[in-house]
C-alpha cells in the first residue's frame, strides 16, 4: 500500500473508560497532530477510517459498526461506544486518507471495571481546593457531548462510598459540587454519576476525581529560612567534617517553583574547587506546604574553608531570601605541658 504518515502509538493519551458506560473518543489527529480540523478534511474529500488491535494481539482489524443497537458507531471524528465492554480494550487507530494523502495515529483504550464504591485502576484527576476559602466548586468532568442540551440528566454525587446528602459544608448543585470553608477532612475521592436517557435506554456516566485541600494564598509568605540562623555557630578544627543544614519552609503556592541553593564565597558549589557535597530532602505538610533541607558537607575542612562565606538562598513565587551560616575555626585548647610550661619560663 502507498506510504502513510504514521504518528505511531500515542501513549500520552492513555484513554481509560468504565465498562458498561458510554464513551466518546475523538480521533487525536485533529487535536494534536494536524493543523486542520475534521470539517476541513471532510470538505476536502478526505475520509476517516477506524480500526483496532485487540489486547494481546498483533492483528489489525476493522471495527465492526454493525453490532446490535449500534453499540459502536462513528460520528464525524468521534468513535462512540454505547456502551463499552471489557473486551473493547486495545489499541485504536484513526486514519485520514484519500488517493493522494494519508495520515494515521494509534492510541490505547483501556476499559476498566469499578466496584460498588467506585474504586478502580482508573487514574484520577486531582482538584486542589484552598483551605478555608469561602465557596469553591468542582465540576463533573468530561460529560460534554454525551447528550443534547434539551436532555436534563440526573446527577448524584458521592464522597467515597457515601451519597452526599446533608453534608454540612459540601453541597451538590447539579453538575457542580460546592465546598464551603473547606477543611482537610474534605480530602478524598468524589464521584458524580450522570444518568440520562437515549433512544429508550438509560445510560450512566461515572466520573471520579480526587480533592486535595491545600494552603491558601492569603496565608502564603515568602520562604522562611529556619537554618542556618544566628543562634548556631559551626565551630570546627581543620580536618573535621563540616555539616551545615539549610532548612527552608515554603508556603503552598499553586504552580510555584521552590528553590534552595548554597553559595560559597558568592559562587555555586559546582563552580569552586573544594570537595563539597550537597544532599537534599523534601517533606510536605497536610496542606502541601513544603520544607526543603539541603545539607552542605565538606568531609575534611581546611582552615581556608573555615574562612569562607557560606550562604543559604531560597526562592519561591513569593520572594527570595538568604541567610549566612556562622562558621569559624575552633581555637585549640592549650596543652599544659608545652604551652603553659613555656609561659612559666621552663626549658
Amino acid at each position: 500500500s502507498e506510504r502513510c504518515d504514521d504518528w505511531g502509538l500515542d501513549t500520552m493519551r492513555q484513554i481509560q473508560v468504565f465498562e458498561d458506560e458510554p464513551a466518546r473518543i475523538k480521533c487525536p489527529l485533529f487535536e494534536h497532530f494536524l493543523k486542520f480540523n475534521y470539517s476541513t478534511a471532510h470538505s476536502a474529500g478526505l475520509t476517516l477510517i477506524w480500526y483496532w488491535t485487540r489486547q494481546d494481539r498483533d492483528l489489525e482489524e476493522p471495527i465492526n459498526f454493525r453490532l446490535p443497537e449500534n453499540r459502536i458507531s462513528k460520528e464525524k471524528d468521534v468513535l462512540w461506544f454505547r456502551p463499552t465492554l471489557l473486551n473493547d480494550t486495545g489499541n485504536y487507530t484513526c486514519m485520514l486518507r484519500n488517493t493522494t494523502y494519508c495520515s494515521k495515529v494509534a492510541f490505547p483504550l483501556e476499559v476498566v471495571q469499578k466496584d460498588s464504591c467506585f474504586n478502580s485502576p482508573m487514574k484520577l484527576p486531582v482538584h486542589k481546593l484552598y483551605i478555608e476559602y469561602g465557596i469553591q466548586r468542582i465540576t463533573c468532568p468530561n460529560v460534554d457531548g454525551y447528550f443534547p442540551s434539551s436532555v436534563k440528566p440526573t446527577i448524584t454525587w458521592y464522597m467515597g462510598c457515601y451519597k452526599i446528602q446533608n453534608f454540612n459544608n459540601v453541597i451538590p448543585e447539579g453538575m457542580n459540587l460546592s465546598f464551603l470553608i473547606a477543611l482537610i477532612s474534605n480530602n478524598g475521592n468524589y464521584t458524580c454519576v450522570v444518568t440520562y436517557p437515549e433512544n429508550g435506554r438509560t445510560f450512566h456516566l461515572t466520573r471520579t476525581l480526587t480533592v486535595k485541600v491545600v494552603g491558601s494564598p492569603k496565608n502564603a509568605v515568602p520562604p522562611v529560612i529556619h537554618s542556618p540562623n544566628d543562634h548556631v555557630v559551626y565551630e570546627k578544627e581543620p580536618g573535621e567534617e563540616l555539616l551545615i543544614p539549610c532548612t527552608v519552609y515554603f508556603s503552598f503556592l499553586m504552580d510555584s517553583r521552590n528553590e534552595v541553593w548554597w553559595t560559597i564565597d558568592g559562587k555555586k558549589p559546582d563552580d569552586i574547587t573544594i570537595d563539597v557535597t550537597i544532599n537534599e530532602s523534601i517533606s510536605h505538610s497536610r496542606t502541601e506546604d513544603e520544607t526543603r533541607t539541603q545539607i552542605l558537607s565538606i568531609k575534611k575542612v581546611t582552615s581556608e574553608d573555615l574562612k569562607r562565606s557560606y550562604v543559604c538562598h531560597a526562592r519561591s513565587a513569593k520572594g527570595e531570601v538568604a541567610k549566612a551560616a556562622k562558621v569559624k575555626q575552633k581555637v585549640p585548647a592549650p596543652r599544659y605541658t608545652v604551652e603553659l610550661a613555656c609561659g612559666f619560663g621552663a626549658t
Epitope: I131, E132, I135, N168, N169, I181, S185
Partner: antibody, heavy 118, light 107 residues
Framework: EVQLLESGGGLVQPGGSLRLSCAAS????????AGWVRQAPGKGLEWVSA????????LYADSVKGRFTISRDNSKNTLYLQMNSLRAEDTAVYYC???????????WGQGTLVTVSS | EIVMTQSPATLSVSPGERATLSCRAS??????LAWYQQKPGQAPRLLIY???TRATGIPARFSGSGSGTEFTLTISSLQSEDFAVYYC?????????FGQGTKVEIK
Amino acid sequence: EVQLLESGGGLVQPGGSLRLSCAASGFTFEHSSAGWVRQAPGKGLEWVSAISYDGEGTLYADSVKGRFTISRDNSKNTLYLQMNSLRAEDTAVYYCARFRYYTAFDYWGQGTLVTVSS
Amino acid sequence: EIVMTQSPATLSVSPGERATLSCRASQSVSSNLAWYQQKPGQAPRLLIYGASTRATGIPARFSGSGSGTEFTLTISSLQSEDFAVYYCQQYNNWPWTFGQGTKVEIK
C-alpha cells in the same frame, strides 16, 4: 493587641429579631475567618456559625439554620449575626471569635448576652 | 456530627497536684483538637491546638496529647489561677463541636 468587641445583645420577645455586631482590631480582619459561639446560662459552649474571610462561605449549626445570618463588612472590620425568629432556647451569651484551621478559635470577644423572654 | 465527651465532669484537685482531663471523639478528628479554659464571667481562652501545641503565652505546665479519638489535657502542677472549666473542641469536620466541659475545683 488583638481585640474583639461584641455589641447588640439585650432582651427580646420570642419571635423577635436582634442584630449582633463584633468590632475587630489588632489583626488583619480581612484575612481571617470568623464565627459565633454561644453559651446558655450554666451550660457549655455551642458553635453557632462561621464565615470565610471573604464573606462568601457561610455555615450554620442545625439549631439556627434558616433563622440566623452571619455576615461581615471587611471595610469596617466588623462581623455581624442577624438573628430572626428568636426562641427561648436562643438565650445565651454570644461570643465572636476568630478562627484559623490550624489553631481553631484563637481569639475571643468578651461576649454579649441575648435574653429571649416574654 | 461528631460528639465530644469529656470526663470527669468535675475534678477535685489540691494546688500543686497534677490534673488529667480526658476528651473522647465519636469518630477520628486526627489531631484537630483544641482545649480552652474558661473562668466565671470570662470568655474562653485557647490553651492547646493541634492536640498538643501550646497557644501563645500559655505556661508549660499545660500539655496536650492524643490523636484520633482519645485526647488528654494535663496540668502538671495546679496553680490557684488554674481552677476553671476546661472544654475540648474538634475542628476536623463541620460542624465544629465542643465537649460538655470539665470543672477543675479546689479539693
